[in-house]
Structure formats: structure tokens, C-alpha cells
């Protein structure tokens, strides 16, 4: 058993049928010695008397808010949460496996640049009685500071019969140098509590590996005289690290017909312009990627050929 | 359709082309190592990230773009010793910081070159003959060093008398390649920045 926060405790249980559970001793936070009784949640049934209460915690029915009283007055509370260990592996019931980029990916994180700011998000089908708390650091043995905001509900989607909820959090490394070569990964830790169930999820990454630039901005077409060709031009996104000559991007230019089945013409360039043939009803899209370290491509920025 | 990669004209900053080749070569070598050594801990998540140049060179600090010198987090350990020769410097652009930057890159390359050559000698003794260093990568390191053209003492190749532990050598190779790839990215950024200056 360990303390998650004041008056909230997590009991770690080896979770299998007929498991013996864990013996837990609760102590009433009071100078009083006599006439103390204990109850669980809203029940008025007295579980025991005395300054301490010994309970065997086996199932969720044994978890909850234990309260000690004296003469009708509440003295203190202890909330017990359960953390299930199933065959040596902590349970992951609360969050959905996003399966990208690999199985058992519960937290996904992205950064728009090298400033040390990043966003993480996760999915759940649970809509109520759910709280999250996020901590982060650079490295784990001698951790350096990363400050995270509060997790917020950022999207709701309908998936088949289920509703899916996306939560996200923004974090900022306290003293980040965009040009630094990372040798210690960023660690992100999310505590999730659903009703009386506690779970924790972690992700470890280098900022360089989660970079995903914003799409190029100011995408424009300039027809070339007496030709089916057009000059496409664009600019670096505002959110990208500067100077651009140091933090350079490379670009992919795509000409896509109306039908998804039509052959796509793709051109790769380090410049911020390209000459392509613009077909009727086609659209031109451009996306960006770090020129020197192949992390994710940005989303596409698009304009119609007409 | 891929656009052919533009080759820099001779008037351009002469090291840019070599640094691009370096990054390509080390990335290819790392990919080859990951595939060949699939039963070894060779992914970025599994290895310890060690920098053999730590406390010996200061490439990131010495090569910091001017725009980032205002960022206090980037100024933890700015070096102040200066070396001023090297053929990548167009004379009118010669500056103390630029010379220090390029000499630091040269020292990095020299250190990695020695490590890789020592390691290759060990890998050649492996009866499994599982993996060797790409000669192209070693040649590209050499070319960039020649282009930088700094005078410095030659570092003797380390020789080891004890029987090599091939498992450890292969893990060390992965660690070195990951670190060298990160340094090659920095070198490429620096060359691109200097070329634009």
C-alpha cells in the first residue's frame, strides 16, 4: 500500500480468483483514543472500533472511503483504491490501446518543434468518475524538470456502438535548448483513476522522435505562361524552430486527381517552391518533414488546381 | 517521382555536400545494423545513449546559431578556446566562433573514426562474420575530415590484447551508430546554417 495523495491510498493486488488479497491497517488521524468507530462509504454499518482498523482487501467491494467517527462526528477519511496486477502485468483497463506506432501504445505524444513543448493524448471509452494526473521529467534517475498542465477532454468520437473520449495534456521542458542533442529521454507518467480503480501509464521518448511539423503555410499557385505547369510556393509554418537555415525542412509536393484511384504525382524538394503540372479538377498538396532527422511528416496543406 | 537531389555548385560552402553524404551513410549503416542485429538490443529505446565526445569536444555549443545564443538553456558550457585554420572557411567569413565550431566537428569525426576502425578490426575476428562497418561510411568520414583540413595530432588506433567479446562489441556498435547519427544531424544543420550565412 502507498499514498497517492493526502488520504488516498493505493493497494496493489495480485489479481486472480480466490487470491488472499492484502492485509491493510488503517489508522484514524485523531488524538482521540476511545469511542472510535469505522464505516465504509455511505453505509452506516460499523466495521470495527478503535483507533486502527485491520481489513483484508481482496476485491473492489473492499475498497472505497473508510471513515472513522466519534459520537456522530467525522474524524478522518482514508480512500482506498485498487491497482490490479494480472499475472505479473499491471492492468490497463482504463485507456485504449492506440496500436500506433506499435501495440500497447496507450499514450501518444507529438511536438511541433524543438522548443521542448509537446502534447500527449490518450483514449478511453469511460465517460464518468474518471480523473487523470500527469507528471513528466527528462530522465528518471536524476530527473530534470518538465511542467505539465491539467489533462483536458479534447475530443469525443462515436466508434461503432461506443463513444470514445480523447484527453490531452501540454507539457514544457523547463530549460530546453532547441539545438541540444538529447541523451536522456523525456518520461511521461499518467495516473488514471476510474471509480476505485487506479492505473498508471508511462511513455518514454526523445523530442526528436516525436517531431511533427505543422503543415506549410501560405500555399499558393502561380500559372506559368503558355504552359500547363504551375509554380507552387509555400512557407515554413510559424510554429517551426528557427533559424530555418539550421532547422531545415524538406517537402513533398503531391498532385492528386479528384478520384482517389488516380495516380498521384509526387515531388520531393528542399526548396519552398516547385513546378508541377496542374490537371483539371486536381488538387496540389504539400507537407513537411525535418530535413535531417526523419520523424513524422506534417499533415497536408492543399489548394485546388482551378 | 522523386526530384533528383541537387548537388551544390563548387562555389558553395564546400563541406555541405560531404556532411549530407555523411548523414546518409551513417543512417544507412544504422538501419543495416538494426536489421542484422535484430536479436540484440539495438533500437533507440533499448540502448544506453552514450556520447564518446562528451567533455572532449563541444560541437553543439561551439556551433550554436547566433539566434540561439540568447537562449540561456543553450549557453551552459560555451567554450572560449579558438582554433583558426581549415579549408572550409572562405577567408572573408573566417570568424573565431566558426573556426572553433569546425575544429570541434573535425575532432568529433576523428574520435568516431578511431572508434569505428578499432571496432571493425574486432568484428573482422568474429567467426559469425555477422556485421562489418560500411567502408563507404568510413570513406565519407575521411572525406569530410579532409575537407575540414585541420591540423591535429593523429590518434593511435586502440589495440586490445584480450579476446574480444563479440556480443558486447555489437551492442557497442549500436550505441556508437546511434550517437554518431545524432552528431551527423547536428553537423548537417551546422553546415546548412553556415552555407546560408
Amino acid at each position: 500500500i502507498w499514498e497517492l495523495k493526502k488520504d488516498v491510498y493505493v493497494v496493489e493486488l495480485d489479481w486472480y480468483p480466490d487470491a488472499p488479497g492484502e492485509m491493510v491497517v488503517l489508522t484514524c488521524d485523531t488524538p482521540e483514543e476511545d469511542g472510535i468507530t469505522w464505516t465504509l462509504d455511505q453505509s452506516s454499518e460499523v466495521l470495527g472500533s478503535g483507533k486502527t482498523l485491520t481489513i483484508q482487501v481482496k476485491e473492489f467491494g473492499d475498497a472505497g472511503q473508510y471513515t472513522c467517527h466519534k459520537g456522530g462526528e467525522v474524524l478522518s477519511h482514508s480512500l482506498l483504491l485498487l491497482h490490479k496486477k494480472e499475472d505479473g502485468i499491471w492492468s490497463t483497463d482504463i485507456l485504449k490501446d492506440q496500436k500506433e506506432p506499435k501495440n500497447k501504445t496507450f499514450l501518444r505524444c507529438e511536438a511541433k518543434n524543438y522548443s521542448g513543448r509537446f502534447t500527449c493524448w490518450w483514449l478511453t471509452t469511460i465517460s464518468t468518475d474518471l480523473t487523470f494526473s500527469v507528471k513528466s521529467s527528462r530522465g528518471s534517475s536524476d530527473p530534470q524538470g518538465v511542467t505539465c498542465g491539467a489533462a483536458t477532454l479534447s475530443a469525443e468520437r462515436v466508434r461503432g456502438d461506443n463513444k470514445e473520449y480523447e484527453y490531452s495534456v501540454e507539457c514544457q521542458e523547463d530549460s530546453a535548448c532547441p539545438a541540444a542533442e538529447e541523451s536522456l529521454p523525456i518520461e511521461v507518467m499518467v495516473d488514471a483513476v476510474h471509480k476505485l480503480k487506479y492505473e498508471n501509464y508511462t511513455s518514454s521518448f526523445f523530442i526528436r522522435d516525436i517531431i511533427k511539423p505543422d503543415p506549410p503555410k501560405n500555399l499558393q499557385l502561380k500559372p506559368l505562361k503558355n504552359s500547363r505547369q504551375v509554380e507552387v510556393s509555400w512557407e515554413y509554418p510559424d510554429t517551426w524552430s528557427t533559424p530555418h537555415s539550421y532547422f531545415s525542412l524538406t517537402f513533398c509536393v503531391q498532385v492528386q486527381g479528384k478520384s482517389k484511384r488516380e495516380k498521384k504525382d509526387r515531388v520531393f524538394t528542399d526548396k519552398t517552391s516547385a513546378t508541377v503540372i496542374c490537371r483539371k479538377n486536381a488538387s496540389i498538396s504539400v507537407r513537411a518533414q525535418d530535413r535531417y532527422y526523419s520523424s513524422s511528416w506534417s499533415e497536408w496543406a492543399s489548394v485546388p488546381c482551378s | 517521382r522523386n526530384l533528383p537531389v541537387a548537388t551544390p555548385d563548387p562555389g558553395m560552402f564546400p563541406c555541405l555536400h560531404h556532411s549530407q553524404n555523411l548523414l546518409r551513410a551513417v543512417s544507412n549503416m544504422l538501419q543495416k545494423a538494426r536489421q542484422t542485429l535484430e536479436f540484440y538490443p539495438c533500437t533507440s529505446e533499448e540502448i544506453d545513449h552514450e556520447d564518446i565526445t562528451k567533455d572532449k569536444t563541444s560541437t553543439v555549443e561551439a556551433c550554436l546559431p547566433l539566434e540561439l545564443t540568447k537562449n540561456e538553456s543553450c549557453l551552459n558550457s560555451r567554450e572560449t578556446s579558438f582554433i583558426t585554420n581549415g579549408s572550409c572557411l572562405a577567408s572573408r567569413k573566417t570568424s573565431f566562433m566558426m573556426a572553433l565550431c569546425l575544429s570541434s566537428i573535425y575532432e568529433d569525426l576523428k574520435m568516431y573514426q578511431v572508434e569505428f576502425k578499432t571496432m571493425n578490426a574486432k568484428l573482422l575476428m568474429d567467426p559469425k562474420r555477422q556485421i562489418f562497418l560500411d567502408q563507404n561510411m568510413l570513406a565519407v568520414i575521411d572525406e569530410l575530415m579532409q575537407a575540414l583540413n585541420f591540423n591535429s595530432e593523429t590518434v593511435p588506433q586502440k589495440s586490445s590484447l584480450e579476446e574480444p567479446d563479440f556480443y558486447k562489441t555489437k551492442i557497442k556498435l549500436c550505441i556508437l551508430l546511434h550517437a554518431f547519427r545524432i552528431r551527423a544531424v547536428t553537423i548537417d544543420r551546422v553546415m546548412s546554417y553556415l552555407n546560408a550565412s
Epitope: 486472480y16 480468483p17 496486477k85 506499435k102 | -
Partner: antibody, heavy 115, light 112 residues
């Protein structure tokens, strides 16, 4: 004490269907994940499928994906394995078992796929 | 499709020490715990070892499990006639959990 009693096995022709049941008692069935494991005659143990305690997630071996469906009825304390498009290579003793560091197995039920 | 490799058979005379190996990889045994089962003919498997080395109550202390790196082993110290059975190791793969990974199985024969 924990008990898992299996039923539903038998002889079936290739291409036909069969449903296995596993009745649980002696524990809070709705709190635990459950597996199906099979063993072809003279062969080793092969995992077939898993279902979460609340039925929200199901996992299958590649060899049965798309043909077998694992399900549970927590109100009846019963686990099921619906097997469709059965093949000769599905012939095996099928076991249900609880998920956890200490597990409990059913007695096994024989499924024979033969023409 | 078995990822965990065991010797097909091992044998010993009563009182001898018999060991069975179970060889896996970094993503399974290297990252997860190992269980060992005993299966007597015509019966369901019985748990002998969980979490690499602990024994459930009721399992004789002549059975012991260990794990090192990407391999595990089961030792029977002072093998007895009633130990003649098939033995299976089991673990998980970190990418496919909760799918159970079973070893290929080992037939233990007690001679004499």
C-alpha cells in the same frame, strides 16, 4: 472453491459450427479475464482467445481470427467460444482458464472435426 | 508458431536432478514473467511455478524455477516416478499480451 465446468464438445463436419461453454463458480466471475486454450492430439498447448473481465476487449490467435468468437455472460457466470467454419486442424481438447498468476483450468472438452 | 523453445524430452533416474530449459527472446521472456505447467496424460495442465520462481501452495519444493535474460528453466531436484509427465513453460510477448505464449513442451521420463 473455484470451479470451471465445460460443455459443448463433440464431433462436427468441416465447415460447420459449434459452441463451447464454460460455467464458472466459487469466485466473482465478472472481475476476471478468461482464456480459451486448445491441445491437438499428441501436440502442445496453443492459446486460442482471451476476453476482458467486462467483455470490452477480445483477442484471438491468428489461426482462429474471423472464425471463432469469444464472449461471456457475466449474469450467468459463463464463458463461450463460438466456432464457425471448422477445419480438421481445429480438432483438439479445448480448455477454458482464468487469467492471473494463479490460474484455474476447466476439465477440457474434445472437439473433433471430421467428415 | 512456437516462440518459446524447450527440449522435446529429458530423462533421469529417481533421485536425480532434472532440468528443462525454455528459450525465448527480449520481447517475451526478456520482458515478462514465466510460468511452468505439468500435464499428466488425459488431464488439464497444473500450475507448478508462477512469476519465474514462486510455487503455489501444494506444489512440492523439489520443483524450482529460475529466469536469466531471455531464458528460463525448471529444475526437479530428486525426480520421482510420479513426475513423469509433459512440462510447458508459458510467458507473454510485450506486443501481443494478453495472448499466452506456450513453450513447445518437454516429456520427462523417469527411468528404472
Amino acid at each position: 472453491q473455484v470451479q470451471l465446468v465445460q460443455s459443448g464438445g463433440g464431433v462436427v463436419q468441416p465447415g460447420r459450427s459449434l459452441r463451447l461453454s464454460c460455467a464458472a463458480s466459487g469466485f466473482t466471475f465478472s472481475s476476471y479475464g478468461m482464456h480459451w486454450v486448445r491441445q491437438a492430439p499428441g501436440k502442445g498447448l496453443e492459446w486460442v482467445a482471451f476476453i476482458r473481465y467486462d467483455g470490452s476487449n477480445k483477442y484471438y490467435a491468428d489461426s482462429v481470427k474471423g472464425r471463432f468468437t469469444i464472449s461471456r455472460d457475466n449474469s450467468k457466470n459463463t464463458l463461450y467460444l463460438q466456432m464457425k467454419s471448422l477445419r480438421a486442424e481445429d480438432t483438439a481438447v479445448y480448455y477454458c482458464k482464468t487469467h492471473g498468476s494463479h490460474d484455474n483450468w476447466g476439465q477440457g472438452t474434445m472437439v473433433t472435426v471430421s467428415s | 508458431s512456437y516462440v518459446l523453445t524447450q527440449p522435446p524430452s529429458v530423462s533421469g533416474t529417481p533421485g536425480q536432478r532434472v532440468t528443462i530449459s525454455c528459450s525465448g527472446g527480449r520481447s517475451n521472456i526478456g520482458s515478462n514473467t514465466v510460468k511452468w505447467y505439468q500435464q499428466l496424460p488425459g488431464t488439464a495442465p497444473k500450475l507448478l511455478i508462477y512469476g519465474n520462481d514462486p510455487r503455489p501452495s501444494g506444489v512440492p519444493d523439489r520443483f524450482s524455477g529460475s529466469k536469466s535474460g531471455t531464458s528460463a528453466s525448471l529444475a526437479i531436484t530428486g525426480v520421482q516416478a510420479e513426475d513423469e509427465a509433459d512440462y510447458y513453460c508459458q510467458s507473454y510477448d510485450r506486443g501481443t499480451h494478453p495472448a499466452l505464449l506456450f513453450g513447445t513442451g518437454t516429456k520427462v521420463t523417469v527411468l528404472g
